[in-house]
Amino acid sequence: APVPPGEDSKDVAAPHRQPLTSSERIDKQIRYILDGISALRKETCNKSNMCESSKEALAENNLNLPKMAEKDGCFQSGFNEETCLVKIITGLLEFEVYLEYLQNRFESSEEQARAVQMSTKVLIQFLQKKAKNLDAITTPDPTTNASLLTKLQAQNQWLQDMTTHLILRSFKEFLQSSLRALRQM
C-alpha cells in the first residue's frame, strides 16, 4: 500500500478522531517508508555480508546517491525551511531511479519493495503541496535515469548486492534527516 494503513482498531473506535494535519500526514508517510526500508534491509543483511562491511569500504563506490549537506539548510546550523524543503523533494525525485532498481532485487520482500517505491511517490506529492517555491525543484532527466538503470542492472552479483545495500542505507539516512528537519518547521 502506498499510504500507511488507517489507525489500528482501538484508535478507530476512539470518538471524535480528528483528521491528520498536513504535517502529521507527511511525518506518518516518512515513518511508513522507513519501516519498509527496515524490512528490506533485514532481507539484504540475511542474504549477504554487506551489512558488516565498514562505512569506509562501502564509500568507495561511484553511486551518486542524494545526501544532505550543510548548504541544503536541513541541519540545525543554517536551517532554512524553504531551501530544505526543496532539497528533500529534489532528493526524493533523484532516489526514484534507485527505488526502481530495487524492484527486482528482493524475493520474499517483493511487495515491500513496491510499497516503498509507491509510498515515496505519494510522499513527493504531499511535500509538493507544502512547498511554495516549486520552480526551484529540478526533475531528473528520464534519459539519464534510463541509462543509469541499465548500467546498474548490468553489474555483477556482488556489485548488485552492494548497490542494493548502499541505496537502502542512504535512503534511510536521507529520510531520517528529512523527518528531523520537517519536525522543526
Partner: antibody
C-alpha cells in the same frame, strides 16, 4: 538557557487557563518546544510540541481538541491554552526545549495546575 | 500508539555498583529514543538521545544502547547523585510517550 513557566493555579472543572513559558539565553526562534506534564506522584506525560515556525504542531490524544500550543518568537514566549479542563489535567506543567532530534535538552521549573471544584 | 515498558519499576543499588535499566517499545522506534533523570521535586534532565548519544555535560559513566524495540541505559560505578527516577521517551510516532519510570534508590 532559562525557561520560566507561569499561569498555573486552581481552576474549576470545565474552566480554562493559559500557561506561558518565557525563554532566555538562546535564540528561541531556532528551536522546537514541548509541553510536558506530571500528575502528583506520577510519571511524565508528553502534552504537545510546536516547531520553530509553528507549521508543525503535535498533541497527545488526551488533550487534542482541548489544548492549543502556540508561540510568539519575537517575544521569546511559548503558550499552552487549556480549555474544558478536567480533574485528570491536574499536574505540574513543564515547558522544554527540543534539540534537533526531538529530545528535551532544557526544562523549566514547572507551573502547577489544579483542576478542582 | 507506541507503548514503552520500562523495567525494573524500582531497584536498590549501592554506590560503586553498575545498574542497567531497560525500555521495551511495542514497535520499532528506529533509535528515536531519549533517557532522562529526575530527582525528587526537580525538573527532569536529558541524559541520552538518539538511543546512544550522551547529552552535553552528562558524565561518561552513563551510556545508552539498543535498537529496534529494545533499549537500555547503563550506569557504571553509581555515584550518590545518580539516585532518583529515570524515564525513557520515544520520538517515533506521536504521541511521543514516556516509559513508566524506574526509581533508583540507595541500598
Amino acid at each position: 538557557v532559562k525557561l520560566q513557566e507561569s499561569g498555573g493555579g486552581l481552576v474549576q472543572p470545565g474552566g480554562s487557563r493559559k500557561l506561558s513559558c518565557a525563554a532566555s539565553g538562546f535564540t528561541f526562534s531556532r528551536f522546537g518546544m514541548h509541553w510536558v506534564r506530571q500528575a502528583p506522584e506520577k510519571g511524565l506525560e508528553w502534552v504537545a510540541y510546536i516547531g520553530r515556525g509553528s507549521s508543525t504542531i503535535y498533541y497527545a490524544d488526551t488533550v487534542k481538541g482541548r489544548f492549543t500550543i502556540s508561540r510568539d518568537n519575537p517575544k521569546n514566549t511559548l503558550f499552552l491554552q487549556m480549555t474544558s479542563l478536567r480533574s485528570e489535567d491536574t499536574a505540574m506543567y513543564y515547558c522544554a526545549r527540543s534539540n534537533w532530534d526531538g529530545a528535551m535538552d532544557y526544562w523549566g521549573q514547572g507551573t502547577s495546575v489544579t483542576v478542582s471544584s | 500508539d507506541i507503548q514503552l515498558t520500562q523495567s525494573p519499576a524500582s531497584l536498590s543499588a549501592s554506590v560503586g555498583e553498575t545498574v542497567t535499566i531497560t525500555c521495551r517499545a511495542s514497535g520499532n522506534i528506529h533509535n528515536f529514543l531519549a533517557w532522562y533523570q529526575q530527582k525528587q521535586g526537580k525538573s527532569p534532565q536529558l541524559l541520552v538521545y538518539n538511543a546512544e548519544t550522551l547529552a552535553d555535560g552528562v558524565p561518561s559513566r552513563f551510556s545508552g544502547s539498543g535498537s529496534g524495540t529494545q533499549y537500555s541505559l547503563k550506569i557504571n560505578s553509581l555515584q550518590p547523585e545518580d539516585f532518583g527516577s529515570y524515564y525513557c521517551q520515544h520520538f517515533w510516532s506521536t504521541p511521543w510517550t514516556f516509559g513508566g519510570g524506574t526509581k533508583l534508590e540507595i541500598k
